[in-house]
């Protein structure tokens, strides 16, 4: 499956929207930095099969959608930007779903990618626990926004690599 160019553009648009969502001066949030333990190895195209990497991307976008769809998230961010962000994520989920099912049979996906999906879920669990611990403070959301931007950037670069391998 060749990830469409539109998916890459969508990813870039999502990153731009994330960048625009900042509401407070992030310089005041330095002490709130946290090690979320991004599961980089899950997205390593050399170690894993293409279908597994795509499946991990899918899970990351799904979890990002879930994270930013909460009541607490809606209170933290600009509604218009958030709606645009949802649309980009939804489009990417559709692209990736088509790609994963094309790579392997649907019934094989769950088993084959269980570990990588679990690693992504645990990563987002750590993010959610951090936000809860910080009582969803503006700085906690800023730190999470920066973290999601970094993980998106990382996966975007890997998607470019996957397209080149084709």
């Amino acid at each position: 499956c060749d990830l469409p160019q539109t998916h890459s553009l969508g990813n870039r648009r999502a990153l731009i929207l994330l960048a625009q969502m900042g509401r407070i001066s992030h310089f005041s949030c330095l002490k709130d930095r946290y090690d979320f333990g991004f599961p980089q190895e899950v997205f390593d195209g050399n170690q894993f099969q293409k279908a597994q990497a795509i499946s991990a991307f899918h899970e990351m976008i799904q979890q990002t959608f879930n994270l930013f769809s909460t009541k607490d998230s809606s209170a933290a961010w600009d509604e218009t930007l958030l709606d645009k962000f949802y649309i980009e994520l939804f489009q990417q989920l559709n692209d990736l779903e088509a790609c994963v099912t094309q790579e392997v049979g649907v019934e094989e996906i769950a088993l084959m990618n269980e570990d990588s999906i679990l690693a992504v879920r645990k990563y987002f669990q750590r993010i959610t626990l951090y936000l809860m611990g910080k009582k969803y403070s503006p700085c906690a959301w800023e730190v999470v926004r920066a973290e999601i931007m970094r993980s998106f950037s990382f996966s975007t670069n890997l998607q470019k690599g996957l397209r080149r391998k084709d």
Partner: antibody, heavy 121, light 107 residues
Framework: EVQLVQSGAEVKKPGESLKISCKGS????????IGWVRQMPGKGLEWMGI????????AYSPSFQGQVTISADKSISTAYLQWSSLKASDTAMYYC??????????????WGQGTLVTVSS | DIQMTQSPSSLSASVGDRVTITCRAS??????LNWYQQKPGKAPKLLIY???SLQSGVPSRFSGSGSGTDFTLTISSLQPEDFATYYC?????????FGQGTKVEIK
Amino acid sequence: EVQLVQSGAEVKKPGESLKISCKGSGYSFTSYWIGWVRQMPGKGLEWMGIIDPSDSDTAYSPSFQGQVTISADKSISTAYLQWSSLKASDTAMYYCARHPGLNWAPDFDYWGQGTLVTVSS
Amino acid sequence: DIQMTQSPSSLSASVGDRVTITCRASQSIDEFLNWYQQKPGKAPKLLIYFASSLQSGVPSRFSGSGSGTDFTLTISSLQPEDFATYYCQQAHSFPLTFGQGTKVEIK
């Protein structure tokens, strides 16, 4: 390969203006902040301020607030440090360094080679 | 502002010695502390970040410890290339501040 390349040494007279630069390459320039550090002859390191090139938001040390201006042009991956009126006490080596922002990653992991600014009448 | 105080300001040691430099913050900075090495005419080089994480490419003889207000940089066995000035820097909040430096000289 990540690199921060600073502009060359400058010799200026008191009262003159100056703008020095720091060009980043080998990484996503807008994903990191750029900090500026002063080192006067034979002295220690002093943090001056920082900029987020993605939105040009800045923060300054109170000691340098109003004395210098930090800016960036993300289209050419370059950060700047400028003075509108130099003083003899501005004579120092100035370093730029990249900072991971709010991400959990090493602070100031890459530094420019430094720009020596000499202010003398 | 958070003040950073390093001690000693200078020390003399021999190759193979174990060297310890301490850094104290004027208020708690959790583990937001970095250590840098600077040689004459060169830019500083990051050694340790977040109090105890070894920066990529830095020899394992360098280690950092501490949290809150008291921190330590240890060089387990001093090598000829380690003679330099070392700075601690708090990364907890702006304005970022450095210690005054510790110069490690040859005995």
